[in-house]
Amino acid sequence: VEVQVSEDPVVALVDTDATLRCSFSPEPGFSLAQLNLIWQLTDTKQLVHSFTEGRDQGSAYSNRTALFPDLLVQGNASLRLQRVRVTDEGSYTCFVSIQDFDSAAVSLQVAAPYSKPSMTLEPNKDLRPGNMVTITCSSYQGYPEAEVFWKDGQGVPLTGNVTTSQMANERGLFDVHSVLRVVLGANGTYSCLVRNPVLQQDAHGSVTITGQPLTFPPEA
């Protein structure tokens, strides 16, 4: 028996369902009573879901997995993973045994988009050219860790005096806080871009300082 899986990682958004595709080619006369199908974590071999001795033996993984029982006889051994969590990320092995056996691994990459950044300024009044200000760009509930870029109004990257911290919450999602310390010119726009490297999703935030008062551009 030959097992086939997708070579590319399966990308799944947090809280959505994902399908880990796996298939085999049944011989003529194949019956499910002959099938041993086991999904397991590749690294540890912890059972995820199994179908053996003609029976679906259920989810051994947070009760969030299911097979496609009506499609098994056609050689579809795919696994449905419901309400994906950050902790589900990793490699899963599809093991199929009929008379001989084969197995293949599928990678699951979990992702969550970052929120539109919120911008704060400190100090936020009585600003004069030459003052040192701290601009904070905050974006929430993303995964995996973000890449953060700062630019000025002319699109020139600002790399000095930037401090970025990323903290995971109890669900494993990251909150990003990036701080730019800059000396004010007569006026200027400062923008931050928070990029999710898996989703290739960019979230933008900017602040424009025009002497007095401080203005935030309207959201797009």
Epitope: Q40, Q46, L47, E53, Q57, F95, S97, F101
Partner: antibody
Framework: QVQLVQSGAEVVKPGASVKVSCKAS????????MHWVKQAPGQGLEWIGM????????NYNERFKTRVTITVDKSTSTAYMELSSLRSEDTAVYYC??????????WGQGTLLTVSS | DIQLTQSPSFLSASVGDRVTMTCSAS?????MYWYQQKPGKSPKLLIY???NLASGVPSRFSGSGSGTEYTLTISSLQPEDFVTYYC?????????FGQGTKLEIK
Amino acid sequence: QVQLVQSGAEVVKPGASVKVSCKASGYTFTNYWMHWVKQAPGQGLEWIGMIHPNSGAFNYNERFKTRVTITVDKSTSTAYMELSSLRSEDTAVYYCARSTALATGYWGQGTLLTVSS
Amino acid sequence: DIQLTQSPSFLSASVGDRVTMTCSASSSVSYMYWYQQKPGKSPKLLIYDTSNLASGVPSRFSGSGSGTEYTLTISSLQPEDFVTYYCQQWSSYPLTFGQGTKLEIK
């Protein structure tokens, strides 16, 4: 016919580890789940965990997860259950049992483990 | 975990009696399995898939039920039947057993 023959009785000290074996014969060892079940003196049955010899997939009862390791040796058709950090409450008969559909249809004769200082 | 509660825990009856014991699950299960255990011996599978007799088991044993309520019935008790009976489920992990029903001679 299906036979599961377990290793002999053990007396071990608290804190130690023990490894119980279960040699299978009379069927294709790699095709069926092998389970381990505990029965304390005068008590009921408690599932410890299981392993599929062919893929090596395993699943443990959370109550035993930190202290149990179930393994197989396909070349000798033998399953093993190792229990660590033993305490007096682990004194029990331990059974290996082969799956039959969603049941445990064939059982070993049991191994008595006594944990005593 | 799915809890299985067997009732009664002890059952007194006489040879030739018809007896029924119950296994109640804390959540719905697809199938129930029944085992017989004699003192000092390994459990023996009696009933699989709720109502099917395991190989070599006398026809006086029968099982029924669905959802959360399952029963094992022995139609005419024989002297060798006065032992302990356990139910078991594999609808979800961990696999669980009932606490047992001990059948005693009245």
